[in-house]
């Protein structure tokens, strides 16, 4: 970077190199050129040289002054310009930054998703900082009072198994840059207590022809936990407004939940999962597409499991009596 | 060598306006800061705009008495320097003079053109 | 800005004279001082650049010199010519400021 030229002289900035966002700041420029009593003193921002608020303060120093400076970043450098040199000599150079102290982290929320063989921790870091800033978080065991640390520039993945001092413990952020230190609040938990179940897929649905066309979305987890409460969220793809639908779910075996849908038109369907009057929810599944026909044939929409959830495409095949279509909207 | 032509010079009324021209040949013109210095009847040189070289990202300075009606432009492949003179004043007649600038001193003059603000 | 004060505003003198112009800027401007010449209905010419540096095709006679606030112009030897209004010009600081100007007329 900048800072690694060799200098012919001193750069600084006041109030410091790294400082708040939209404070005034001045740099200094200090000229130690053998035979050059400089003329002029130059300053440059990213490569392009500077034209207002340069004061010279005396034969080998001149100030630069930006009034609200909001550039998270800039490569500052200063030349001289002496009697008998055609080009302007190096002084010095410098990288700055500007930006915020962290915010107070809050929302701290750790789960341990089934078969990840981590506790997750994430929590809201509050408005960007723009430099460098780091997170200590702690994880403190209620029952032999040990304490261990993590440092991090976002969330962070504690093995469980390194988590010996039993099952109850307080975990609490850190925050700290050059600006500033921000501890949030400390959140208690208990490893029983903030287990995810493993992810809830849609495979596929089916409309049945009959008096009054139904649809089946079948659907499924490879969770070991035995009491699941789910939710099943639906809507067409033209509204606004969800339906959910709530189920008690045991995952021996894939589930089959009906709905009464109108005919000929494209709906999204969605699910999530938790362990039975725990706290934490999976995430909503990925959107899964099915369209209700017009009127008589059955109609299969298939997610298929390799497939990521991705394009814009139809993928259509007719056979005989029925219409298949995969869960990848138009 | 270097010759700086103005144009666009001439008589209007308070409030109207006038846009001034420079046509610039024999140097490197986006190398070149470019000015506008004006001198009233019988009095000294003022700078009144200025459009730097590329070097400094053509940052442009007006006087305080311009300011908010005068608009400084180049176009570099025309070679050409532009002053949009807008909402002007009695207290803006004078020769107004192109000139260039490598280092901060005026290096080459144009013979200038004479704007007249008068009812 | 940087305040620049020639003087005198205006001198009388004879072909062969030497004349001195001086200019004073409120602040040390380093040797970043122009001169120029104007001569009535004509465009201001640079005679001398950086204090004391003479400008190609600039007759010898003129000189500059001077440090810090105070800034001279020298013509050793008035010649008919050289009867016009001289201009400083410091561009030490931005925005580059002149002196009133010095009128050099004929005794």
């Known amino acids: 970077g900048i800072t690694n030229i060799n200098c012919s002289g001193h750069i600084w900035v006041e109030p410091a190199t790294i400082f708040k966002m939209g404070m005034n700041i001045s740099i200094y420029c200090q000229a130690a050129i053998k035979n050059c009593q400089p003329r002029k003193l130059h300053f440059y921002k990213n490569g392009i040289k500077e034209r207002f608020q340069i004061t010279r303060i005396n034969k080998t120093t001149a100030r630069l002054w930006y009034k609200n400076f909001l550039e998270p970043h800039a490569s500052m450098y200063c030349t001289a310009e002496c009697p008998k040199h055609f080009q302007e000599t190096l002084i010095c150079g410098k990288d700055i930054s500007s930006g915020y102290p962290p915010d107070i982290p809050d929302e701290v929320t750790c789960v341990i998703y089934e078969y990840s063989g981590n506790m997750t921790c994430t929590w809201n870091a509050g408005k960007l900082t723009y430099i460098d800033t780091k997170y200590v978080v702690h994880v403190k065991s209620l029952e032999t009072e040990e304490e261990q640390q993590y440092l991090t520039s976002s969330y962070i993945n504690i093995s469980t198994d390194s988590l010996q001092g039993g099952k109850k413990y307080l975990v609490w952020v850190q925050a700290a840059n050059a600006l500033g230190m921000e501890e949030s609040k400390q959140l208690q938990i208990h490893l029983d207590d903030i287990v995810i179940p493993s992810a809830a897929v849609i495979s596929r649905a089916e409309t049945i022809n009959a008096t009054v066309p139904k649809t089946i979305i079948y659907w499924d987890s490879q969770t070991t936990i035995e009491k699941v409460s789910c939710e099943m969220r639906y809507k067409a793809t033209t509204n606004q407004t969800w339906n959910v639908k709530e189920f008690d779910t045991n995952f021996t075996y894939v589930q089959q939940s009906e709905f009464y849908l109108e005919p000929n038109i494209k709906y999204v369907f969605q699910v999530r999962c938790q362990e039975t009057g725990k706290r934490y929810w999976q995430p909503w599944s990925s959107p899964f597409f099915h369209k209700t026909p017009e009127t008589v044939p059955q109609v299969t929409s298939k997610a298929f499991q390799h497939d990521t959830w991705n394009s814009g495409l139809t993928v259509a095949s007719i056979s005989t009596g029925h219409l298949t279509s995969d869960n990848r909207g138009d | 060598q270097v010759q700086l032509v103005e144009s666009g010079g001439g008589v209007v009324q308070p409030g109207r306006s006038l846009r001034l021209s420079c046509a610039a040949s024999g140097f490197d013109f986006n190398s070149y800061g470019m000015s506008w210095v004006r001198q009233a009847p019988g009095k000294g040189l003022d700078l009144v705009a200025d459009i730097n070289s590329k070097s400094y990202n053509y940052a442009t300075y007006y006087a305080d008495s311009v300011k908010d009606r005068f608009t400084i432009s180049r176009d570099n492949s025309k070679n050409t320097l532009y002053l949009q003179m807008n909402s002007l004043r009695a207290e803006d007649t004078a020769v107004y003079y192109c000139?260039?600038?490598?280092?901060?001193?005026?290096?080459?003059w144009g013979q200038g053109t004479l704007v007249t603000v008068s009812s | 800005d940087i305040q620049m004060t020639q003087s005198p505003s205006s001198l009388s003198a004879s072909v062969g004279d030497r004349v001195t112009i001086t200019c004073r800027a409120s602040?040390?401007?380093?040797?970043?001082l122009a001169w120029y010449q104007q001569k009535p209905g004509k465009a201001p010419k640079l005679l001398i650049y950086h204090a004391s540096s003479l400008q190609e095709g600039v007759p010898s006679r003129f000189s500059g010199s001077g440090s810090g606030t105070d800034y001279t112009l020298t013509i050793s030897s008035l010649q008919p010519e050289d009867f016009a209004t001289y201009y400083c010009?410091?561009?030490?600081?931005?925005?580059?400021?002149f002196g009133q100007g010095t009128k050099v007329e004929i005794k």
């Open positions: 010009l410091q561009d030490s600081e931005y925005p580059p400021t």
């Open positions: 602040q040390d401007i380093y040797t970043n």
């Open positions: 000139a260039v600038h490598h280092s901060d001193y005026f290096e080459y």
